[in-house]
């Protein structure tokens, strides 16, 4: 009679992450007599995975009734795979013995992949808020995947960036791999609306690649315009001169009014309008009463913005002219501050 | 008051490398942006580019072609200016300088950093 | 890149006259027009920023204006200590540039 062969038919299987692996192994004796065990991988570390005789194995269920007597199937299913559970699987004939079996042959191993999705890709961008014109970052990481192989793409608005630098970890063999990614992206003033997207492409995902998202709303800030303008005269005595606040973000914003370097006034913007780029506008105005002035005053319009340093225009309000007579502030009537101009 | 201090003069051979910082004192470091700026001898002045200690953001001229590298350290409130594959035409001295976040003129300068490559 | 062309290139003048340099931008750059001093050996100084706010500390016989593409720098009664080199810079768009110079000599 010819020497019983442990046969695993199958060189490797391919497993889906949370499926079941079937790990197939048919012995051609009945001779000798022994149980059957399987174990993941070779030597004297190998670990143990179901052992017919004795055990508690929660996961592992036989193909077959391994309690009857003509049976020689001792293929397993090991439930819910992770990507811990890749390795190469033997299975091991023993022969009955005294007080210990004894092993008697392997099969020559079956080797587990396990395919696992990667997690969706989490977008994160600079620490602070960044002006247009600048490039900032943004990183893309996805984890637990396998195979290696994985394809990341970055996109602005629909369109593909190429300033970027990815790296899957770890370089060498691994139950899971990681991918981290840099992108450099462009700010515009016209980003309030924008997104940035990282796109992962896996063999799991089956054409359909995972998306993770930042809004450039939480990145840009868009510094505001003034203009100080000196409008008709309401009263005889009175003057009334607005503050044109254009084109900011976020609406975070402080206006303080000078006279004179005293101030006069301090408001939050409230009832701002938003124009279609994202970017809000807002108007605020003082009304001046020249009676109460001897000599020219200066106006200063100041604002903070978003927690930045303060930034201001400046506007002379003549008072040795007629109210009447004034008009609009020109470029010659704007002076300076103690303040960074906005302009 | 405000200052900012720049690392002492360089001689550099062509192709090499150079380093220039410009530590920044008397501001809140993370709300100005810190530009670099060169003046050739006897010429006039060339932006290079600039970077917000906040946000690590960068704006360069792309006249360098990817030969400036700005990076700051928070910790020292330190930026630093590097250039690459140094050629004789980059003779010149290097200017740091001070501007409010978001398109605003450069109200502080440091005192300058003489960068010679020669071979 | 926007062209700043700054003229003249230098000119003469004697203490108590009234200089004028302009600044010719090649695009709209709105206000957003720096002037500043040079003295040999020496970091550039900010004058004026925004066309037309004095910086702190800068006397009031510098002056600003313009709008659009076409800025001016007055000194409207020359002193000793202005003879210098005078750059203007436009801050709208990068790259920032500058003017080529206008230097101020002694007549």
């Known amino acids: 009679e010819e020497e019983l062969q442990v046969i695993q038919p199958d060189k490797s299987v391919l497993v889906a992450a949370g499926e079941t692996a079937t790990l197939r192994c048919t012995a051609t004796s009945l001779i000798p007599v022994g149980p059957i065990q399987w174990f993941r991988g070779a030597g004297p570390g190998r670990e143990l995975i179901y052992n017919q005789k004795e055990g508690h194995f929660p996961r592992v269920t036989t193909v077959s009734d391994l309690t009857k007597r003509n049976n020689m199937d001792f293929s397993i299913r090991i439930g819910n795979i992770t990507p811990a559970d890749a390795g190469t699987y033997y299975c091991v004939k023993f022969r009955k013995g005294s007080p210990d079996d004894v092993e008697f042959k392997s099969g020559a191993g079956t080797e587990l992949s396990v395919r696992a999705k990667p997690s969706a890709p989490v977008v994160s961008g600079p620490a602070a808020r960044a002006t247009p014109q600048h490039t900032v970052s943004f990183t893309c990481e996805s984890h637990g995947f396998s195979p290696r192989d994985i394809t990341l793409k970055w996109f602005k608005n629909g369109n593909e960036l190429s300033d970027f630098q990815t790296n899957v970890d770890p370089v060498g063999e691994s139950v899971s791999y990681s991918i981290h990614s840099t992108a450099k992206v462009v700010l515009t003033r016209e980003d309030v609306h924008s997104q940035v997207i990282c796109e992962v492409a896996h063999v799991t995902l089956q054409g359909d690649p995972l998306r993770g998202t930042a809004n450039l709303s939480e990145t840009i800030r868009v510094p505001p315009t003034l203009e100080v303008t000196q409008q008709p005269v309401r009263a005889e005595n009175q003057v009334n001169v607005t503050c044109q606040v254009r084109k900011f973000y976020p609406q975070r914003l402080q206006l303080t009014w000078l006279e004179n370097g005293n101030v006069s006034r301090t408001e939050t913007a409230s009832t701002v309008t938003e124009n279609k780029d994202g970017t809000y506008n807002w108007m605020s105005w003082l009304l001046v009463n020249v009676s109460a002035h001897r000599d020219d005053v200066k106006l200063t319009c100041q604002v903070e913005h978003d927690g930045q340093p303060a930034v201001s225009k400046s506007h002379d309000l003549k008072v040795s002219a007629h109210p009447k007579e004034q008009g609009s502030n020109t470029a010659a009537e704007n002076t300076g501050s103690n303040e960074r101009n906005i302009y | 008051q405000v200052q900012l201090v720049q690392s002492g003069a360089e001689v550099k051979k062509p192709g090499a490398s150079v380093k220039v910082s410009c530590k920044a004192s008397?501001?809140?470091?993370?709300?100005?942006?810190i530009h670099w700026v060169r003046q050739a001898p006897g010429q006039g002045l060339e932006w290079m580019g600039d970077?917000?200690?906040?946000?690590?953001?960068?704006a360069n001229n792309q006249k360098f072609k990817g030969r400036v590298t700005m990076t700051r350290d928070t910790s020292t409130s330190t930026v630093y200016m590097e250039l690459s594959s140094l050629r004789s035409e980059d003779t010149a001295v290097y200017y740091c300088?001070?501007?409010?976040?978001?398109?605003?003129?450069?109200?502080?300068w440091g005192q300058g950093t003489l960068v010679t490559v020669s071979s | 890149d926007i062209q700043m062309t700054q003229s003249p290139s230098s000119l003469s003048a004697s203490v108590g006259d009234r200089v004028t340099i302009t600044c010719k931008a090649s695009?709209?750059?709105?206000?957003?027009v720096a002037w500043y001093q040079q003295k040999p050996g020496k970091a550039p100084k900010l004058l004026i920023y925004?066309?037309?706010s004095l910086e702190t500390g800068v006397p009031s016989r510098f002056s600003g204006s313009g709008s659009g593409t076409d800025f001016t720098l007055t000194i409207s009664s020359l002193q000793p200590e202005d003879f210098a080199t005078y750059y203007c810079q436009q801050y709208w768009t990068t790259p920032w540039t500058f003017g080529g110079g206008t230097k101020v000599e002694i007549k």
């Open positions: 925004g066309t037309a």
């Open positions: 300088a001070r501007a409010v976040s978001g398109y605003y003129a450069m109200d502080y």
């Open positions: 008397g501001y809140t470091f993370t709300d100005y942006e």
């Open positions: 695009e709209d750059i709105y206000d957003r």
């Open positions: 970077i917000h200690p906040g946000s690590g953001g960068t």
